[in-house]
């Protein structure tokens, strides 16, 4: 289900990544240099920026982030 409108609920931040609020709704997600071999799970639909640099992701399937706008 959709997350309720709230100012006190945290947007989804993938495990080990660092997250930073970006305005009222959005989230900047830094998953760099984590040795990831695939995209992190539970990415928020409110993600405005995603850093996957310095990882081991060799290929991406078509439309790898369908939940992101």
């Amino acid at each position: 289900g959709s997350s309720p409108r709230s100012g006190v609920l945290l947007r989804g931040c993938p495990t080990h990544c660092h997250c930073e609020p970006d305005g009222r709704m959005l989230l900047r997600v830094d998953c760099s240099d984590l040795g990831l071999s695939e995209l992190p799970s539970n990415l928020s639909v409110f993600t405005s920026y995603l850093d996957l640099s310095m990882n081991n992701i060799s290929q991406l399937l078509p439309n790898p982030l369908p939940s992101l706008r």
Partner: antibody, heavy 117, light 107 residues
Framework: QVQLVQSGAEVKKPGASVKVSCKAS????????MQWVRQAPGQGLEWIGE????????NYNQKFQGRVTLTVDTSTSTAYMELSSLRSEDTAVYYC??????????WGQGTTVTVSS | DIVMTQSPATLSLSPGERATLSCRAS??????LNWYQQKPGQAVRLLIS???RLHSGVPARFSGSGSGTDYTLTISSLEPEDFAVYFC?????????FGGGTKLEIK
């Protein structure tokens, strides 16, 4: 700098109502939610509810539903929390605090509400 | 409601020592955790949001970690001003709930 200045201490009788104010300054009032949290003597923190000053949208803790009303006056950048049907267990320090994207970054100094017959 | 349990209730340490404070949630909160500091007569202070993000102005000796239901606040080397009460708070679902607090006192 961001400041949240709350109204003074209140002493109320059981069954009465109390209205606590929280005047915000140092930021754009309508850009942040306002949270209300209380702390009973020697206890932890308990969330009461929140209001979005941009349109007065509210969420309440079900524990307080029907007894608490959160309002704002955007012309004075002031938030209000009214709690009715007071009982002794409502004796606590009540805090307002602003939030954005899930964390509460500035808190008021607290308002002590004492409920005693 | 999600129940947050902090341990220990009281932690007695000396300046310069390392402090480890624990917070356990009754269900998975997906890293949606904040830590706050409370001192007598002062406003509550945000230390860490999103489990590990240091709020501006918070010294680097504070760090947050954990996942799932178990989270930790670590103070690498205690300074005299760190002795206070610390609360964790989950931001995973309404209502947000706080732990009972850990009082960090001087040994």
């Amino acid at each position: 700098q961001v400041q949240l200045v709350q109204s003074g201490a209140e002493v109320k009788k059981p069954g009465a109502s109390v209205k606590v104010s929280c005047k915000a300054s140092g930021y754009t009032f309508t850009n942040y939610w306002m949270q209300w949290v209380r702390q009973a003597p020697g206890q932890g923190l308990e969330w009461i509810g929140e209001i979005d000053p941009s349109d007065s949208y509210t969420n309440y803790n079900q524990k307080f539903q029907g007894r608490v009303t959160l309002t704002v006056d955007t012309s004075t950048s002031t938030a209000y929390m009214e709690l009715s049907s007071l009982r002794s267990e409502d004796t606590a320090v009540y805090y307002c605090a602003r939030s954005l994207s899930g964390y509460v970054d500035y808190w008021g100094q607290g308002t002590t509400v004492t409920v005693s017959s | 409601d999600i129940v947050m349990t902090q341990s220990p209730a009281t932690l007695s340490l000396s300046p310069g020592e390392r402090a480890t404070l624990s917070c356990r949630a009754s269900q998975d909160i997906s890293n949606r955790l904040n830590w706050y500091q409370q001192k007598p007569g002062q406003a509550v202070r945000l230390l860490i949001s999103y489990r590990s993000r240091l709020h501006s102005g918070v010294p680097a000796r504070f760090s947050g970690s954990g996942s799932g239901t178990d989270y930790t606040l670590t103070i690498s080397s205690l300074e005299p001003e760190d002795f206070a009460v610390y609360f964790c708070q989950q931001g995973n679902s309404l209502p947000p709930t706080f732990g009972g607090g850990t009082k960090l006192e001087i040994k």
